[in-house]
């Protein structure tokens, strides 16, 4: 039977012979030189070689345990003379021993890692890893140990877990951002003689909102026409804040002021600058100057840098008016005026007053618009805005005049604004009533007394406040001895009727009737106007069948049967 | 006077690409974000980007249409404002338009005349 | 994503009308971030009211803004021969978004 137990050997050997490894034997070898030992498997003859004779193997190459740490080869003993085993082919192992011939190397040569501002001391940042490629079976070859080389006092390292931690309380990303740890792994437990490596760790810290946002002065003045319109930027303020991005973004509000109701501000979405803007109309003449105080706070806090303060500022934003010259200002959006229709030339009418509402208060002249008053029927005072007739006027012409004035500021011409007058005229009773329409009329010769042959309507041009009340007589001078008489119906009408029994066309075919028509109005106005009658045979109904030789002009719908 | 003048439309195959350009002038650039509007033939307008300024990093930001096809880009030196269209679809058949916000950076002040984008095949 | 819904999409009116048209946004935004703009065929858009309330510059005194929260409004005291046009709303929170427009045609 075989007889040898597992073989060892030191890997990286460097001395000038080859290495013993060890004595394949056999109890069948008697020393005569009779068996012959043979050997197969991993690196056979080339790395391993054996004395055929003796059994002795020996390495002939220095070996390295972290390439290969196991060589498995196969033993023969065979009889020289005859050829045939005297044991059966048997496999063995060489094991390479293990020294610590390697140095831990970390799985990144750099790492690069962040850490809020302001941690807590312990803090986990980030674990970095070494490995040692020597045996972690036996001995400390490869039992890494970590310690921080650079880094101190600011960060730590678990020296068996390779964790890095925060060491230093307060570490403020506005006074230094940037680390670069160097961290060491040594092997043999840390100790004397142990192989190492190093890797750097390059650390950022990152933001946290831990400072508020600051205006760089207390006070901000801007100026801003008055005639500056909602919505107008009027100025930009910026308080600064020493963190970045989110942390750093910045809300501003007005927060108190005569101004709250007049300007508000807005906060720019990329600058952070805060905005004034105009929100109202101003007035220099109401008022000059205006004091606003402005917030600046960051909309995102973190309540554990509370204790730190209030995040937020204010800044006292003076905002002066500056003055626009502005045209005149009437006192109404519009005048209306009356006058009665009678009034002479240069009768006053009313009157219109506009002012400068500048400061200066600049005189005004007033005008009228020649495209309003074609016809320079008005006029004006142009220094005190009287308005007075230039030409006579007629209610039944026209009843409104619509005409523009104008203000203008005598110092500066440019300036001037318009206002329209619109002026009723006021009737007056000038015009006497008139027939309605041209009357000629029939009466049928065998007409009854009384009987209603037309009825007579009346218009005026006039246009008095309790309605038209006319009344209808002869006129004197046909009154007595007339055929026909006049009865007023006391409703702006009046009807013509026979006065006698019969009529004969023969003796008189036409009869004019002066008709006096009057108002009830002051003064009193009248007119005459004629009514022609004429006189025709009928039929027994009353229907015209022949009259004297002219046609009437208008005999439809006429009848003594009315 | 702000002014914005688009360049670089044209047809393109669908798959092409092609480069739109805005020339700004008139008003500081640099303290603006900038943006893309697009209007297909009859349609309303559609956002495309907007690129901000260099104080947040020229961050950008896109619609979901054009999102890995599309790139925004700045160059303050030349005020000018780019876009570049990869992958082009018939969808992205448009007016283009390229936009300055109001002062503040709020809305979409300033528009240029546009530069049509044809993709047929 | 903030959505914006305009309504009505189209409205016929009137010179002289008083005209209305509402954005209501999908989740509350300050009224800083909310605008108006009208955009006439073949023209770019026109900032018209910004911040919700303020008119932009040379915008006649006949439009006005209100709002706050997620319900926003333009509106037109007396229509004019010119204000025939696409209004739309539009959110600056990114993603910005765009109401779908209002078409203002004449009746």
């Known amino acids: 039977s075989w007889m040898w137990n597992q073989f060892f050997l030191l890997e990286e050997y460097t001395g000038s012979d080859y290495q013993y490894v060890g004595k394949l034997h056999s109890d069948q070898d008697r020393g005569d030189g009779s068996l012959k030992y043979i050997l197969s498997g991993d690196g056979a003859g080339d790395l391993f070689i054996i004395n055929e004779n003796t059994g002795d193997i020996q390495a002939t190459k220095r070996l390295d345990r972290e390439e290969k740490p196991v060589y498995i080869l196969r033993a023969q003993a065979i009889n020289r003379r005859t050829g045939r085993p005297v044991e059966p082919e048997s496999e063995f192992i060489i094991k390479i021993h293990d020294i610590n011939d390697n140095e831990p190397i970390f799985t990144k040569e750099v790492y690069t890692a962040t850490v809020p501002e302001m941690s807590d001391v312990g803090t986990f940042v980030v674990q970095v890893t070494a490995t040692d490629a020597d045996d972690p079976t036996y001995g400390n070859s490869a039992k890494v140990v970590y310690s921080i080389l650079q880094g101190q006092p600011y960060f730590s390292v678990e020296s068996e877990t390779g964790i890095i931690k925060t060491a230093l309380l307060n570490m403020d990303r506005e006074n230094r951002e940037q680390y670069q740890v160097v961290i060491q792994a040594k092997d043999m437990g840390g100790q004397m003689g142990g192989l190492s490596g190093t890797t750097t760790v390059n650390i950022t810290l990152t933001d946290v909102n831990d400072n508020p946002p600051r205006f760089p002065q207390s006070t901000y003045q801007f100026k801003t026409p008055e005639s500056s319109p909602p919505g107008t930027p009027i100025g930009r303020i910026k308080a600064s804040d020493a963190d970045v991005g989110e942390n750093a973004e910045i809300e501003y509000s007005i927060t108190d002021g005569e101004g709250l109701d007049m300007f508000d501000v807005i906060t720019d979405q990329e600058t952070q600058e805060g905005i004034i803007t105009v929100k109202k109309l101003l007035d220099f003449e109401k008022k000059k100057v205006y004091t606003l105080k402005v917030e600046a706070s960051n909309p995102y806090v973190e309540p554990r840098f509370l204790y730190l303060g209030p995040f937020k500022d204010s800044a006292t934003v003076r905002i002066v008016v500056e003055d626009v010259d502005e045209p005149p200002v009437f006192s109404k959006l519009a005048y209306i005026l009356q006058i009665r229709e009678d009034a002479q030339i240069n009768t006053t009418i009313g009157s219109v007053t506009a002012q400068d509402p500048d400061a200066a208060r600049n005189p005004v002249k007033y005008s009228v618009d020649r495209h309003t008053d074609m016809d320079r029927i008005f006029n004006i005072d142009s220094g005190n805005g009287s308005i007075f007739t230039s030409k006579l006027l007629d209610r039944e012409t026209l009843l409104w005049h619509n005409i523009t004035v104008i203000a203008t500021e005598i110092n500066n011409p440019k300036q001037s604004s318009r206002v329209p007058l619109y002026i009723k005229v006021l009737d007056v009773n000038d015009n006497a009533p008139e027939f309605a329409e041209f009357y000629e009329t029939f009466v049928c010769e065998k007409a009854k007394a009384d009987q209603l042959i037309q009825t007579l309507h009346a218009v005026d041009k006039d246009d008095p406040y309790s309605g038209h009340q006319f009344s209808f007589s002869l006129a004197p001078e046909a009154a007595s001895g007339s055929n026909f008489t006049i009865q007023d119906n006391k409703d702006n009408t009046a009807g013509i009727l026979t006065r006698k029994n019969g009529y004969n066309r023969h003796e008189m075919s036409t009869y004019l009737l002066p008709v006096v028509i009057s108002d009830n109005d002051y003064p009193v106005q009248s007119s005459t106007g004629t009514v022609t009658v004429r006189v025709c045979a009928c039929d027994h109904h009353g229907n015209m069948q022949s009259c004297h030789a002219e046609a009437l002009i208008h005999p439809t719908g006429l009848s003594t049967g009315a | 006077e702000v002014q914005l003048v688009e360049s670089g439309g044209g047809l393109v195959q669908p798959g092409g690409s092609l480069r739109l350009s805005c020339a700004a002038s008139?008003?500081?650039?640099?303290?603006?974000?900038m943006n893309w509007v697009r209007q297909a033939p009859g349609k309303g307008l559609e956002w495309v980007a907007r690129?901000?300024?260099?104080?947040?990093?020229?961050?950008?930001y896109y619609a979901d249409s054009v999102t890995d096809r599309f790139t925004i880009s700045r160059d303050d030196s030349k005020n000018s404002l780019y876009l570049q269209m990869n992958s082009l679809k018939t969808e992205d058949t448009a007016v283009y338009y390229c936009?300055?916000?109001?002062?503040?950076?709020?809305?979409?002040?300033?528009w240029g005349q546009g530069t049509l984008v044809t993709v047929s095949s | 994503d903030i959505q914006l819904t305009q309504s009505p999409s189209s409205l016929s009116a009137s010179v002289g009308d008083r005209v209305t048209i509402t954005c209501s946004a999908s989740?509350?935004?300050?009224?800083?971030?909310l605008h108006w703009y009208q955009q006439k065929p073949g023209k770019s858009p026109k900032l018209l009211i910004y911040?919700?309330?303020y008119l932009a510059s040379g915008v006649p005194l006949r439009f006005s803004g209100s709002g706050s929260g997620t319900d926003f409004t333009l509106t037109i005291s007396s229509l004019q021969p010119e204000d025939f046009a696409t209004y739309y709303c539009?959110?600056?929170?990114?993603?910005?978004?765009f109401g779908q427009g209002t078409k203002l045609e004449i009746k």
């Open positions: 936009v300055r916000p109001d002062y503040g950076n709020y809305g979409l002040a300033y």
């Open positions: 008139g008003f500081t650039f640099t303290t603006y974000a």
């Open positions: 690129i901000r300024i260099k104080n947040n990093n020229y961050a950008t």
């Open positions: 989740s509350s935004i300050s009224s800083h971030y």
């Open positions: 911040r919700s309330f």
């Open positions: 539009q959110q600056d929170i990114v993603p910005l978004t």
